[in-house]
């Protein structure tokens, strides 16, 4: 039975040209995390394999930095980066857990972080 929960940074906003940390955390399970995939709608941003380390997709190589931890730092933000991001935790023996983050990239300096929330 899958008992874990994914905690994410939730709905977040950031300024155009700035950077943002996409972060998820898996809790309430003893399952081993074998890999975390980061996706944006229909394309892969990055993969962190627990043994091998990081793969960064070529579309994002210039402006994505791995970490902190299993998170992802997205730099040089544009308004086109607005949208849903998913962290997909592959675990053993539980299976797959998915967290969702909505990022809004703003033109002005009114960007503020949203509250954290949990996805069961």
């Amino acid at each position: 039975m899958m008992t874990g929960t994914i905690e994410t940074t939730g709905n977040i906003s950031a300024e155009k040209g700035g950077s943002i940390i996409l972060q998820c955390h898996l809790s309430s399970t003893t399952a081993q995390v074998t890999q975390v995939n980061w996706e944006q709608q229909d394309q892969l941003l990055a993969i962190c394999n627990a043994d091998l380390g990081w793969h960064i997709s070529p579309s994002f190589k210039d402006r994505v930095a791995p970490g902190p931890g299993l998170g992802l730092t997205l730099q040089s933000l544009t308004v086109n980066d607005t949208g849903e991001y998913f962290c997909i935790y592959h675990t053993y023996p539980d299976g797959t857990y998915t967290g969702r983050i909505f990022l809004e990239v703003l033109e002005s300096s009114v960007a503020e972080h949203g509250a954290r929330f949990q996805i069961p």
């Epitope: 890999q35 043994d51 793969h55 791995p66």
Partner: antibody, heavy 118, light 107 residues
């Protein structure tokens, strides 16, 4: 960039063999090394990969009790030991190198033919 | 394990023709797909990755597309030297798996 693999091996069933892959033309610890199996006239099968900077390895479960992956950073060489060999292990084994921060197999060695026969 | 299915084992074509090879993943693999070319008696070579980026030195007649479960590799104008087996491969989740290969034959 070059990946130079060891020569062909003829081994007896039940024995072990250690294949080597010497890397040159780049910083060995910056790129993952992977191993791929190809049976004669057949397709490709991923065995596993190793991160030379920390020795971390990941495997195709099918090969977990068959293959052992190691590296020697001082000689920029990756090794794969195959144990308890059977005729099913007769194949060409390739070592490959990834892209920077990439899981793609960007460079390939020439392959080592392993023949298991009594 | 994710199964990568290349529906055609063989494709027969003529020099100058446009040819497409398809690859279907048994489950979602996002854009974590790569295409390799293996000429007779040679090691495979990386052609296309992620799945529309041409690797360094690869001629622009080779292109790739797709996302999710359906992927296509295209040669816009086949040349005699393109005689080879073409493999798709996913690296979305281990074990990374290859398609069975499609052999391109030149008429």
């Amino acid at each position: 960039v070059q990946l130079q693999e060891s020569g062909a091996e003829l081994v007896k069933p039940g024995a072990s063999v250690k294949l080597s892959c010497r890397a040159s033309g780049y910083t060995f610890t910056d790129y993952f090394v992977y191993w791929v199996k190809q049976r004669p006239g057949q397709g490709l099968e991923w065995i596993g990969g190793i991160n030379p900077s920390n020795g971390g390895a990941t495997f195709n479960e099918k090969f977990k009790n068959k293959a052992t992956l190691t590296v020697d950073t001082s000689s920029s060489t990756a090794y794969m030991q195959l144990s308890s060999l059977t005729s099913e292990d007769s194949a060409i084994y390739y070592c490959t190198r990834g892209n920077f921060y990439g899981y793609e197999f960007a460079y390939w060695g020439q392959g080592t033919l392993v023949t298991v026969s009594a | 394990d994710i199964v990568m299915t290349q529906s055609h084992k063989f494709i027969s074509t003529s020099v100058g023709d446009r040819v497409s090879i398809t690859c279907k993943a048994s489950q979602h693999v996002s854009t974590a797909v790569v295409w390799y070319q293996q000429k007779p008696g040679q090691s495979p070579k990386l052609l296309i990755y992620s799945p529309s980026y041409r690797y360094t030195g690869v001629p622009d007649r080779f292109t790739g597309s797709g996302s999710g479960t359906d992927f296509t590799f295209t040669i816009s104008s086949v040349q005699a030297e393109d005689l080879a087996v073409y493999y798709c491969q996913q690296h979305y989740i281990t074990p990374w798996t290859f398609g069975g290969g499609t052999k391109l034959e030149i008429k």
